[in-house]
């Protein structure tokens, strides 16, 4: 009818000039629709270039929205990973400055004189916890070798023992057992402890680090066209009062977000895997309990060298055969006191059962992140009809929305009659963080079985992807050990997004 | 067998900084200490600091500690001594040497390099 | 930090000569001195580490001695080839310290 055709695009207006448009684009009223491209082409308040701005307004508003809810994602990450990495660096300071404190009055030079292999010793263990490419087994036999070799000067000044000499020590010293038990004890615990906290912070890190790249992956055409028809084709067509459909919303975004969708699977294995490692924080080998207490296990294994100098000196000297007396030299060292340290297990703090209280809680809270997504943005951004079904806005005019709701992910979206998606294409950005996730989920596995997946040579395979860019410095091209020369591949998953605590430090 | 090999000479400004090399080969790089010691003209030794390449831990002679800095590269077994605010006394040659076993004793040494301050 | 004081400062001495040189540290170093060799234009080259033991490829006339504070570098038969300048240094704990050097020449 006349009167229809000549409808004032007054709303229209001020809409567009509120986007920041220029209002000289804008109809006075309605016009004839056959340049719409995207829109119905029925009368319409919008002209070529208005439909094509506000497509690109729509895609970028879209995006943005991703990004939002992508970003609360990453936060509540960060600030976990943050929150656990500063307790469990704290442990292991808190540690070696007990050490520094304590060992000087409880060992004296026997402490003094070998300041330095207890400092690398801590500068190892937080290396391997932070990411670097270091087996920590072999870091420690060599701490006690060279700890050992020089004790072993030290209690006995008045012996020549030239390197051959030494040499014939450390092949001895496995059999001797000259620390006791400490080291084997600090070796499993120790092993278990570690391993389960830089896995579950790397877990953080790499789940943190997908979130950013999936936020990055760009909405194709066909989905562009969707959204403008989803979010601005009712104010084209004189509807501007009319929301979308729930269900025409998510469809559209369910085939715009069809490949994020398929992270799910993968993503709950992650999640799930954090969830069940907070397990191994807890008890005697539990990662309070062992990274709080090196000191103590250092201790006891110098306590019993002491204890054990006299038989250990017989049968090294039945092994390595009697070495020569240093005429000019002192005596052999007197006997020190025991060192007397705190008891080996720290009461729990507190701190670390409400870390993992909460980061339990907002994982699980997250687990549905990628299939809720389109579901969430529909509700919080896109304003949707709470009216009745037949007064919202379907794509064509205001009524029903007849279609099914797909499911979710990319071949759920065969038929999708809002989105027109490429099955067969998967996205490779995407593809690629599913791997970060099947990899870190190893990880955690294998970490929840004590195992350090980076030196089980059954995962040695080669192969592997991702972004290589977790790495810390240049933690990741590290040797992993004085006595071999054998290095490993990079790694990949050294705490992503983590700034270096722990300086160089000088001293 | 363990080798050290040093950059080249430099001439350098007053108030400038300097950055030598010493890469290192046939041995595990990350397994030893590496030090610095430096040498006047017709001077005896003096020791700079040392680093452990493993980890990138640093000790710095007091003397030097404001104006030296030293690094290392794993990916290429390379460690650097940079000394900054250079004056005409800091004219020496400049050794890496690295440790015999984890012990302070210095049993092999770079070629040297001579860095002369002058205006 | 540690001072060490060796002497003589110089000394001329005969092919075949005995000559000892030595090493007086300003607190105990227990058995961590070392001895190098410097030749000119030359690095220094290790000689006897921890007081007494002979680094591995050094002939056996040279020798080192001593314990706690005093310590001494011994080459009981001079060769030409043992003209150089000697220091010493302690690995007791750092900053590590060199000896001011003693230079032999051969009469």
């Known amino acids: 009818d006349p009167a229809s055709k000549s409808r004032s695009c007054g709303e229209v207006r001020q809409i567009y000039g509120a986007k920041g448009f220029s209002l000289s684009d804008v109809p006075q009223a309605e016009i004839s629709g056959e340049h719409l491209r995207i829109c119905p082409q029925g009368y319409t308040c919008c002209t070529s270039e208005m439909e094509e701005n506000l497509a690109n307004r729509s895609h970028a508003e879209l995006e943005t929205a991703l990004r939002d809810s992508s970003r609360v994602l990453q936060a509540m990450l960060a600030t976990q990973l943050r929150s656990f990495d500063d307790h469990f660096q704290h442990l292991l300071n808190d540690s070696e400055r007990t050490l520094q404190a304590t060992f000087p009055g409880a060992f004296g030079e026997l402490y003094t004189q070998n300041a330095r292999a207890f400092r690398d010793l801590y500068s190892e263990l937080r290396l391997y916890y932070r990411g670097a490419n270091l087996h920590l087994e072999e870091t420690l036999a060599e701490f006690w070798a060279r700890l050992l070799e020089r004790l072993f000067k030290q209690l006995h000044p008045q012996l020549l023992l030239p390197d051959d000499y030494l040499d014939c020590l450390g092949k001895q010293a496995e059999a001797l057992r000259p620390f006791g038990e400490a080291p084997r004890e600090l070796r499993l615990r120790a092993t278990r402890a570690f391993v389960a906290a830089r896995s579950f912070v790397q877990g953080l890190g790499v789940a943190s680090d997908v979130v950013r790249k999936v936020a990055q992956v760009p909405l194709g055409p066909e989905c562009s066209r969707a959204v403008m028809k989803l979010v601005y084709c009712a104010h084209c067509l004189g509807v501007p009062g009319a929301r979308p459909c729930p269900d025409y919303c998510r469809n559209v975004l369910k085939g715009c977000l069809a490949n994020q969708a398929d992270l799910d699977a993968e993503w709950r294995n992650l999640l799930d895997s954090m969830v069940l490692i907070t397990d191994k924080f807890w008890g005697t080998s539990g990662v309070e309990s062992v990274i709080g207490s090196v000191h103590t296990w250092l201790a006891e294994a110098i306590n019993a060298l002491q204890d054990n100098r006299d038989t250990l000196t017989a049968k090294v000297i039945q092994g390595c055969g009697n070495p020569k007396v240093n005429p000019q030299g002192p005596g052999p060292e007197e006997k020190r006191r025991r060192g007397k340290l705190a008891p080996r297990e720290r009461p729990p703090s507190g701190t670390l059962e409400k870390l993992v209280s909460e980061a339990k809680a907002q994982l699980r809270d997250v687990q549905d992140f990628w299939i809720s997504l389109p579901g969430t943005l529909c509700s919080e951004k896109m304003a949707l009809s709470t009216a009745s079904d037949d007064r919202c806005w379907n794509g064509m005019a205001r009524g029903r929305y007849l279609p099914e709701v797909m499911g979710d992910g990319l071949a759920n979206q065969i038929n999708n009659p809002e989105v027109e998606v490429d099955i067969t294409k998967p996205d490779m950005t995407i593809r690629q963080q599913i791997m970060q996730l099947k990899i870190m989920t190893n990880r955690l596995r294998s970490a929840y079985n004590g195992n350090d997946v980076d030196f089980q040579d059954a995962s040695d395979d080669g192969s592997g992807s991702g972004s290589g860019d977790g790495c810390l410095d240049d933690l990741c091209s590290r040797k992993v050990s004085r006595k071999s020369s054998s290095s490993r591949t990079p790694l990949t998953h050294a705490l992503p997004g983590l700034s270096e605590q722990e300086g160089q430090k000088t001293s | 067998q363990v080798q050290l090999v040093q950059s080249g000479a430099e001439v350098k400004k007053p108030g400038a900084s300097v950055k030598v090399s010493c890469k290192a080969s046939?041995?595990?790089?990350?397994?030893?200490?590496m030090h610095w010691v430096r040498q006047a003209p017709g001077q005896g030794l003096e020791w700079m600091g040392e680093?452990?390449?493993?980890?990138?831990?640093?000790t710095y002679n007091q003397k030097f500690k404001a104006r030296v800095t030293m690094t290392r590269d794993t990916s290429t077994s390379t460690v650097y001594m940079e000394l900054s605010s250079l004056r005409s006394e800091d004219t020496a040659v400049y050794y890496c040497?690295?440790?015999?076993?984890?012990?302070?004793?210095?049993?092999?040494w770079g070629q040297g390099t001579l860095v002369t301050v002058s205006s | 930090a540690i001072q060490m004081t060796q002497s003589p400062a110089s000394l001329s001495a005969s092919l075949g000569d005995r000559i000892t040189i030595t090493c007086r540290t300003s607190?105990?170093?227990?058995?961590?001195l070392n001895w190098y060799q410097q030749t000119p234009g030359n690095a220094p080259k290790l000689l006897i580490y921890?007081?007494?033991n002979l680094q591995s490829g050094v002939p056996s006339r040279f020798s080192g001695s001593g314990s706690g504070r005093d310590f001494s570098l011994t080459i009981s038969s001079l060769q030409s080839e043992d003209s150089a300048t000697y220091y010493c240094?302690?690995?007791?704990?750092?900053?590590?310290?060199f000896g001011q050097g003693t230079k032999v020449e051969i009469k």
């Open positions: 040497a690295r440790e015999k076993r984890d012990d302070g004793v210095f049993a092999y």
């Open positions: 240094q302690h690995s007791y704990s750092t900053p590590y310290t």
């Open positions: 680093i452990n390449p493993s980890t990138g831990d640093t």
């Open positions: 607190q105990t170093v227990a058995g961590y």
């Open positions: 046939g041995y595990t790089f990350t397994g030893y200490y």
């Open positions: 921890s007081a007494s």
